[in-house]
Structure formats: structure tokens, C-alpha cells
Interface confidence: low
């Protein structure tokens, strides 16, 4: 039907309903305009790596599958004008880095999502006129720095954010007329913006409020762009950002419920209304739940994915669903629950995982499900469950564990005990093996009957488990992912800490030096280290090498006298650093370099008298800094800190000066800059080397002699470790 000439394929005006197959791979220009094509699938243009011009205008295209243009690496011009596009799929142009002209005019597009043009950074000409656009999400045009022509005229735009347009230095043609612009305080920026660019945006007029209707935006004075007090007083004085809402074709949407049951879907629909509270996706053919699939839907309370073909779940598939009450996943092909799958689902009350193929449970799988009332694991492939798996389920009332091939050996003894204490298993879970216990109810077997042959330890060595791991070290206790080696008089970290360890408790021991042994390189899951209540005076450089996942370290109640950044090397993810109740006297300007992720730093109850300027400057994420209970010397060396505390507005609990006397107990941030003085010999800066000797004196070891020198004030720089100080025969009138 089509005609081919060189690298051009012409299929225009042939009443085609679909994109023809077998388009030559070397095609550089493809004309499909003037047909009846309704859908572009992800395979229609597969392999056309040389295509430069694609004409799809004047069809009836209403759907473009994500990935449809993925292979079109050389595409430069794409015309999609005069179609029936309503939905603008995100990331559609991810593979088309050379696209410079895109015409989407005369469609029915209602919204431009944030990631609409992600990947198409070279676009120079973008036509979106004559659509029904009412929402342009913040950042939708952010990547389009080379844009020269942008047409948005004849749409339903009421509001725009300044962030959408303030990065287009090359813009020469911009059309925004014939929209519904509402000229309130949120649009004041546009007036300035248009005045600065007198050749663009001509005839852009206000449509509201009524007294400004018909006025050119550029001619309205800034003070005329006003909001009602109710709205102005709203905390975010920004234009309320719109979100791209749409109901997937074939689904129904009402009352914040999206109902896509039994629609033959193969993937999770995107760009659903962000306010939805329930999604019904059961009885489809969905195989994969991708990362962050539901993260935009913060108000989601019920999610039903039952009876699909799900075999693959991204670890963050359900990320951000803090309001989720019910998660229904039964009747799928799930074999394993990835680590952190249910992380953050604090509101979850109902979790149905029955009728899957789950063969193991990570011990921390349910650690955030404090409000879970019902857990169904009925009809899976579980042979064992690690001790502690259910310990976070404080609200659990009902559990279904039947129809699993449980091996009732010593590893499952804990479960029998648990079910004796908590008779919540209502489905009648039974043992499959060993033969002597086959078909007996787990909750009714005496715990002494759960035996292991040989010398197996209390870690599951079963092939179906999620981790085969090391035994619990001698002197430690292992429960779940916590390894507790506290109160054991240890002076070094035990060997052979299990790899799965997420929390390592070494508190209340006899550590004096934390040595660089490389132990943390072997603990990829480690997140928290408790070293409190030891006698640590030094941390060797590299002691924490490999602890890149650790986000909390407790070093409270030790004997550290100074902190240097080399001590903390390797802690790239550290968020909480507790150094309370040590003997730190000075914080240097490089003490915390490399700790850019730290949010909470506690230096409470130390002996800090001074802090070097910029000491906290590299702590880019810092939100809480506890400096209370330190004897700060508010002299000239600390002036910067007062200013910094005022400027940063970080939660600090208001640390107070202890010296000089006239500033005692005054919060540092309340001290006026001129009051931070080094008068009267108060020049102490304990970050300076300790072993100086004043020029007027002689020093031998810790004995300082300043006799008969005609001194009227105490000399500067007396070593802090002085044990004998001779000041006789001078001219003091006051005891210094």
C-alpha cells in the first residue's frame, strides 16, 4: 500500500487503522498522516534506528504506549498534531535525544505531566496550541533549555508556575493568548516576565477576576495581582501546583476510587488522580510492580492486586503509602518478598498474601506493620519462618498459615511457642515433615518435639530460606536482624558477625580503642551500631570503612576527647550521630567533613568550650544539633556560632554560654555579635594546639613560670594541661 523511495516511506491517506508492519529498517522519513490510526504500540516503530522524520498528524490516535518511540535514536521531527490524544504519557521521549521539533497541537491533551519531555533535551520547537491543557506540572519544561518556540495558546490554562519558564534563554516565540488565566497573586510573576520579554507572549490576557478580564497581563500592575486573605494566608504562598489527573481508558473513576477490575491490563496504569483512596486492579494480567508504582497516591487506603500474574515486585513498589489500610495480593505468582517491600506501611491493617508461591520470609519483612490486624500467608510454599518475623506485629489478631509445607524442626519451635501464647492462627497450620509430626497442628504440638538432628544451630539452613547465614557469635544474642553483644566485657568486636545483621549492639562493654579491622565491609545490611557506655578514647582511621549503609551510630557515654573526620570515614549514609556524654573539648572545622547525610548530631554533655568556624558547614542535611550542657566560652572565637545558629534555624535546644561571666546562661544565639569579645585575657581557643608557652613565661613539661614579668593581665596561651603556675612578683590588681 505504501510507496518507498530511497529512505522515505510514504503511507499517507490510505485509511490505515494500524501502523503497517515491515517498515524497512533504514527508513529515515515515514509519512503516516491522514489515516485512521487509533493507537501507537510499543512495537510499531521498533528497530527504526535511522528514522529522522515521523509524520503522524491527522489520524485518530488516542493512545501512545510508553516506549513506542524508544528505538528512534535519530528522530529529529515528530508531528502528532490533529489527533485525539487526551493523555500525555510520561517518559515518552526518553530515547529520542535528537528530537528538536515536536508538534502536538490540535489534540485534546488536558495536562502536561512533570516528566513529559524527559530525555528530549534538544527540543527547539514545541507546539501545544489548541488543546485542552488546564495543568502544566511544575518542571514539565525544565529540561528544555534550548527551546526557541513554545505555543500554548488556545488552551484552558488558568495558572502557571514561574518555575516552568524561567530557564529558557533562547525563547523567541511564545504564545499564551486565548487561555483562562486567572490574574491573582500567584500569577504576578508573569506580568514582570512578559515585560522583560516584550516580543513574546503578545495578547496574553487575564480572564479573571472579573475586574481584570480582558486586560493584557503585561499591563496589569504587580499590586493588582491579589489573593483573598484566606488564600494568601495559606502556608505555601506558591501557586497551588496542579497534578495531571486522568482515568485510564476502560476503567471507571468516581469518589476517589479507580476501578480497573478485569480489564486485561498488563501493567499498572500511570498518571491516575493523585487524590485517589482506592485502586481496584484485580483480575488483570499484570506481571510486574515497578519501583514507586503507587508513590504519587499518598492518600491511598486500599489497593487490590489480587488474581493477576505478579511474579516480580520492586523493593519500593509500595513506597510512600503511609495511609494504606488494605493491601490485597492473593492469587499471584510471588515467590519472594523483596527486602523493605512493606517498609513505611504503618497504617496497614490487612495484608493478604495467600495463594502465592512465597518460599521464604525475611525476618524483617513485616517490621513496620505495627497496626496489622490480619496477615494471610495461606497456601504458599513456606517451609520455615525465622524467629522474630512476627515480633513487630503488635496489633495482630488473625493469621493464616495453613497449606504451607512446614518442616517442624528446631527452627520452628519458636512458632509453636508463639502460637501457644498468641492463639491467633485460625486456619489450622500443620506440619508436613518430619514424618512423626506430619499433619499435626503446629499450635498444638509440644515445643520439645521440635527437634533438629545433629548440631544445627538456631538459624535456618533450609534451601528455601532467604539467607543462609553465620551462627550467632559466642557471647551475643541474635534475634531477627539484631545482634546484641552488650554487657559482655568485650574490648573488640567479635569475629563472624552474621551478614544479615541490621543492628549491632556493642554497648556496655570495655572498648577503649575502636580498631580498623574491616569488619563492617562484611556487613552489607548494617544500619545501626550502638557503642554507648564503653571507655572509647580513640577511633582509628578506617574503623568504619565499609559501613556505607549505616545510618545511626551511638557513641554516648565514652571518653572521646576530640573528634576528627578520619574517625568517621566510610559513613556516607549516616543520619544520626550520638556523641553525648563524652569528654570532647573542642570541635574543629573539619571534625565532621564527609558526613553530609547526618540529620541529627548530638554533642550534649561534653566539655566543649569552643567550636571552630565552619565546623558544621559540611553537614548539609543537618536538622537537629544538640549542643546543650557544654561549657561554651562565648569569646571572639565563638561569634560565628551565634550568627550561624540564628541563620540556620536548626533545632538546637538553645545552647548557652558559660563564660565570660556576664554572658553566663545566655543562649549563644541571643548574644549580640559585639558581645563575643576576647577582652581581659579571655582569648582561649581550645582548638589551637595545647602545648604553647606564653612569650613572657618559661614552660617545662606542665610547669609554667611567669614570675617577675611586670604582668598586669594573665598572659595569653597558657597550656591547658598546666599543673603549676607561677605568677608571683607581678602587678596584678585583681585576681585573674
Amino acid at each position: 500500500q505504501c510507496s518507498c523511495s530511497g529512505s522515505t516511506v510514504d503511507c499517507h491517506g490510505l485509511a490505515l487503522r494500524i501502523v503497517p508492519r515491515n517498515i524497512p529498517r533504514n527508513t529515515e522519513r515515514l509519512d503516516l498522516n491522514g489515516n485512521n490510526i487509533t493507537r501507537i504500540t510499543k512495537t510499531d516503530f521498533a528497530g527504526l534506528r535511522h528514522l529522522r522524520i515521523l509524520q503522524l498528524m491527522e489520524n485518530k490516535i488516542s493512545t501512545i504506549e510508553r516506549g513506542a518511540f524508544h528505538d528512534l535514536k535519530e528522530l529529529e521531527r515528530l508531528r502528532l498534531n490533529r489527533n485525539n490524544l487526551q493523555l500525555f504519557p510520561e517518559l515518552l521521549f526518553l530515547g529520542t535525544a535528537k528530537l528538536y521539533r515536536l508538534d502536538l497541537s490540535e489534540n485534546q491533551i488536558q495536562a502536561i505531566p512533570r516528566k513529559a519531555f524527559r530525555g528530549a533535551v534538544d527540543i527547539k520547537n514545541l507546539q501545544l496550541d489548541y488543546n485542552q491543557i488546564s495543568c502544566i506540572e511544575d518542571g514539565a519544561f525544565r529540561a528544555l533549555r534550548d527551546l526557541e518556540v513554545l505555543t500554548l495558546n488556545n488552551n484552558n490554562i488558568t495558572r502557571l508556575s514561574v518555575a516552568s519558564f524561567n530557564h529558557m534563554p533562547k525563547l523567541r516565540t511564545f504564545r499564551l493568548h486565548s487561555n483562562n488565566l486567572y490574574c491573582d497573586c500567584h500569577l504576578a510573576w508573569l506580568s514582570d516576565w512578559l515585560r522583560q520579554r516584550p516580543r513574546v507572549g503578545l495578547y496574553t490576557q487575564c480572564m479573571g477576576p472579573s475586574h481584570l478580564r480582558g486586560h493584557n497581563v503585561a499591563e496589569v500592575q504587580k499590586r493588582e495581582f491579589v489573593c483573598s486573605d484566606e488564600e494568601e494566608g495559606h502556608q505555601s504562598f506558591m501557586a497551588p501546583s496542579c497534578s495531571v489527573l486522568h482515568c485510564p481508558i476502560a476503567c471507571t473513576c468516581s469518589n476517589n476510587i479507580v476501578d480497573c477490575r478485569g480489564k486485561g491490563l498488563t501493567e499498572i496504569p500511570t498518571n491516575l488522580p493523585e487524590t485517589i483512596t482506592e485502586i481496584r486492579l484485580e483480575q488483570n494480567s499484570i506481571r510486574v510492580i515497578p519501583p514507586g508504582a503507587f508513590s504519587p497516591y499518598k492518600k491511598l487506603r486500599r489497593l487490590d492486586l489480587s488474581n493477576n500474574q505478579i511474579s516480580e515486585l520492586a523493593p519500593d513498589a509500595f513506597q510512600g503509602l503511609r495511609s494504606l489500610n488494605s493491601l490485597v495480593l492473593y492469587g499471584n505468582k510471588i515467590t519472594e518478598l523483596p527486602k523493605s517491600l512493606f517498609e513505611g506501611l504503618f497504617s496497614l491493617q490487612l495484608l493478604l498474601l495467600n495463594a502465592n508461591k512465597i518460599n521464604c520470609l525475611r525476618v524483617d519483612a513485616f517490621q513496620d506493620l505495627h497496626n496489622l490486624n490480619l496477615l494471610s500467608l495461606y497456601d504458599n510454599k513456606l517451609q520455615t519462618v525465622a524467629k522474630g518475623t512476627f515480633s513487630a506485629l503488635r496489633a495482630i489478631q488473625t493469621m493464616h498459615l495453613a497449606q504451607n509445607p512446614f518442616i517442624c524442626d528446631c527452627h520452628l519451635k519458636w512458632l509453636a511457642d508463639y502460637l501457644h501464647t498468641n492463639p491467633i492462627e485460625t486456619s489450622g497450620a500443620r506440619c508436613t515433615s518430619p514424618r512423626r509430626l506430619a499433619n499435626k497442628r503446629i499450635g498444638q504440638i509440644k515445643s520439645k518435639k521440635f527437634r533438629c538432628s545433629g548440631t544445627e544451630d538456631y538459624r535456618s539452613k533450609l534451601s528455601g530460606d532467604c539467607f543462609a547465614d553465620l551462627a550467632c557469635p559466642e557471647k551475643c544474642r541474635c534475634e531477627g536482624t539484631t545482634v546484641d553483644c552488650s554487657n559482655q566485657k568485650l574490648n573488640k568486636i567479635p569475629d563472624h558477625i552474621p551478614q544479615y545483621t541490621a543492628e549491632l549492639r556493642l554497648n556496655n562493654n570495655e572498648f577503649t580503642v575502636l580498631e580498623a579491622t574491616g569488619i563492617f565491609k562484611k556487613l552489607p545490611q548494617l544500619r545501626k551500631i550502638n557503642l554507648s557506655n564503653n571507655k572509647i578514647t580513640d577511633i582509628e582511621e578506617g574503623a568504619f570503612e565499609g559501613a556505607s549503609g549505616v545510618n545511626e551510630i551511638l557513641l554516648t557515654s565514652n571518653r572521646l576527647e576530640n573528634v576528627q573526620h578520619k574517625m568517621f570515614k566510610g559513613l556516607e549514609s549516616l543520619k544520626t550521630l550520638m556523641l553525648r556524654s563524652n569528654r570532647i573539648s573542642c570541635v574543629g572545622n573539619d571534625s565532621f567533613t564527609g558526613l553530609g547525610s547526618v540529620r541529627l548530631l548530638s554533642l550534649y554533655d561534653n566539655q566543649i568550650t569552643t567550636v571552630a568556624p565552619g565546623a558544621f558547614g559540611t553537614l548539609h542535611s543537618l536538622s537537629t544539633l544538640n549542643l546543650l550542657a557544654n561549657p561554651f566560652n562565648c569569646n571572639c572565637h565563638l561569634a560565628w556560632l551565634g550568627e550561624w545558629l540564628r541563620r540556620k534555624r536548626i533545632v538546637t535546644g538553645n545552647p548557652r554560654c558559660q563564660k565570660p561571666y556576664f554572658l553566663k546562661e545566655i543562649p549563644i544565639q541571643d548574644v549580640a555579635i559585639q558581645d563575643f569579645t576576647c577582652d581581659d585575657g579571655n582569648d582561649d581557643n581550645s582548638c589551637s594546639p595545647l602545648s604553647r608557652c606564653p612569650s613572657e613565661c618559661t614552660c617545662l613539661d606542665t610547669v609554667v613560670r611567669c614570675s617577675n614579668k611586670g604582668l598586669k593581665v594573665l598572659p595569653k596561651g597558657i597550656p591547658r594541661d598546666v599543673t603549676e603556675l607561677y605568677l608571683d612578683g607581678n602587678q596584678f590588681t585583681l585576681v585573674p
Epitope: 537537629t624 546543650l628 534555624r649 533545632v651 535546644g653 538553645n654 541571643d670 549580640a672
Partner: antibody, heavy 118, light 107 residues
Framework: QVQLVQSGAEVKQPGSSVKVSCKAS????????VSWVRQAPGQGLEWMGG????????NYAQKFQGRVTITADESTDTVYMDLSSLKSEDTAVYYC???????????WGQGTLVTVSS | DIQMTQSPSSLSASIGDRVTITCRAS??????LNWYQQKPGKAPKFLIY???NLQSGVPSRFSGSGSGTDFTLTISSLQPEDFAIYYC?????????FGGGTTVEIK
């Protein structure tokens, strides 16, 4: 933006205690200061004390020392104010407020009226 | 405790008027002064912090000035929604203390 939602109005006998709660929604306030400020009918505002949940220690106005206890439950993002030995002059609207520093109150709860009457 | 004294305790003004409220501290509080607006039956609303900084979302007709012991809140052109009680508050020393309030009424 943090919203603070307080418990409902209370009527108490003189000599008894009252416990008012203040719950954050729209964001945790574990590292913010949360203060309690009261306002007697037709009167001005009076600070009672405050807490930074993550530090756990409270800070009280001298006037209320020994009679007020402020506690925080991080797991529920709720701060409580317990006032004992109630007198008729404790009849007031009690507000919780949070902000960027100990004594700056950016966001306020809706208020809880406590009436002390025999 | 630091005493905060507001004046006047009440004033009557018309829409469009320029209104000024003053607040005096019993001792130097540098610029640690906040202003709040309270409407009947409602919680106070934060207007200005550190004497002159407008809280996000507060209309620009509100402004604050002063340092040390003397401070001023100005409403450049009074609007109907501005009729309320205004409180100053020092955040310099514990306990934080509030002024007695200034009621702005319609003339």
C-alpha cells in the same frame, strides 16, 4: 506543613488533673519544639512550657513548675500536657504550638477549652 | 520575666487606614520579637518573626520594625479581614512572654 490537632474540651473539678493531647498531621514534629500556651477567657496568652520530642526533656515556665508535665510520644507524633491541682483560674483555652525555635510559634492547634468548676 | 507592654490596648480605624501598634519590652531583647493575629474563637496566627520578617503567606501590607526595646507593627492599608487582636511576643529569654494585645476595631 504541620497541622496540630488537639483533643476535645474538658470540664474538671477543682483539685483534679487534665491531660490534653496535641497530634501532628502533615509531618512529624519529633525535632521541632512543641509548646503549650494558654489563654484565660478575655485574657492574653501565657506560655506554660515546651518540649523537643527527640530530646525528650521539657522546659517549663517557673509559674507552672511542679504542676505541669509535658510529654511526647514519637510513635504517634503526639505531645501531651498534663496539668494537676486544677483551680478555677486554670479555666482557659490551651493551645499547643510548634515552630522553628523554642519560643517562636509558627503553627497552632485549634485549642482545647478546659473548664474548672465545682 | 521580661514584661511586654502594648499600646494602644484598642483602636478604631477605617478600611484603607494605616494602622500602627507599638510594643515595648522591659529590657533589651535585640530583635527577638514576634507578632501574632488572633480572631475571635480562633488560634493565633503567626505574622512576623524577628521583628521585621514576614511569615510566608502573610500579605505584604503587614510590616514590622524595631530593635532593642521598642517595636512597631504597621498595617499599611487596613482590610476588612484585618480586624482582630494583635499580640507581640518576645522570644529572647525564657519564659517567652506576650504583650496584653491590641484590639483593632472597625470605626
Amino acid at each position: 506543613q504541620v497541622q496540630l490537632v488537639q483533643s476535645g474540651a474538658e470540664v474538671k473539678q477543682p483539685g483534679s488533673s487534665v491531660k490534653v493531647s496535641c497530634k501532628a498531621s502533615g509531618g512529624s514534629f519529633r525535632s521541632y519544639t512543641v509548646s503549650w500556651v494558654r489563654q484565660a477567657p478575655g485574657q492574653g496568652l501565657e506560655w506554660m512550657g515546651g518540649i523537643i520530642p527527640i530530646f525528650g526533656t521539657a522546659n517549663y515556665a517557673q509559674k507552672f513548675q511542679g504542676r505541669v508535665t509535658i510529654t511526647a510520644d514519637e510513635s504517634t507524633d503526639t505531645v501531651y500536657m498534663d496539668l494537676s491541682s486544677l483551680k478555677s483560674e486554670d479555666t482557659a483555652v490551651y493551645y499547643c504550638a510548634t515552630g522553628s525555635g523554642w519560643y517562636t510559634f509558627d503553627y497552632w492547634g485549634q485549642g482545647t477549652l478546659v473548664t474548672v468548676s465545682s | 520575666d521580661i514584661q511586654m507592654t502594648q499600646s494602644p490596648s484598642s483602636l478604631s480605624a477605617s478600611i484603607g487606614d494605616r494602622v500602627t501598634i507599638t510594643c515595648r519590652a522591659s529590657q533589651n531583647i535585640n530583635a527577638y520579637l514576634n507578632w501574632y493575629q488572633q480572631k475571635p474563637g480562633k488560634a493565633p496566627k503567626f505574622l512576623i518573626y524577628a521583628a521585621s520578617n514576614l511569615q510566608s503567606g502573610v500579605p505584604s501590607r503587614f510590616s514590622g520594625s524595631g530593635s532593642g526595646t521598642d517595636f512597631t507593627l504597621t498595617i499599611s492599608s487596613l482590610q476588612p479581614e484585618d480586624f482582630a487582636i494583635y499580640y507581640c511576643q518576645q522570644s529572647y529569654r525564657s519564659p517567652p512572654t506576650f504583650g496584653g494585645g491590641t484590639t483593632v476595631e472597625i470605626k
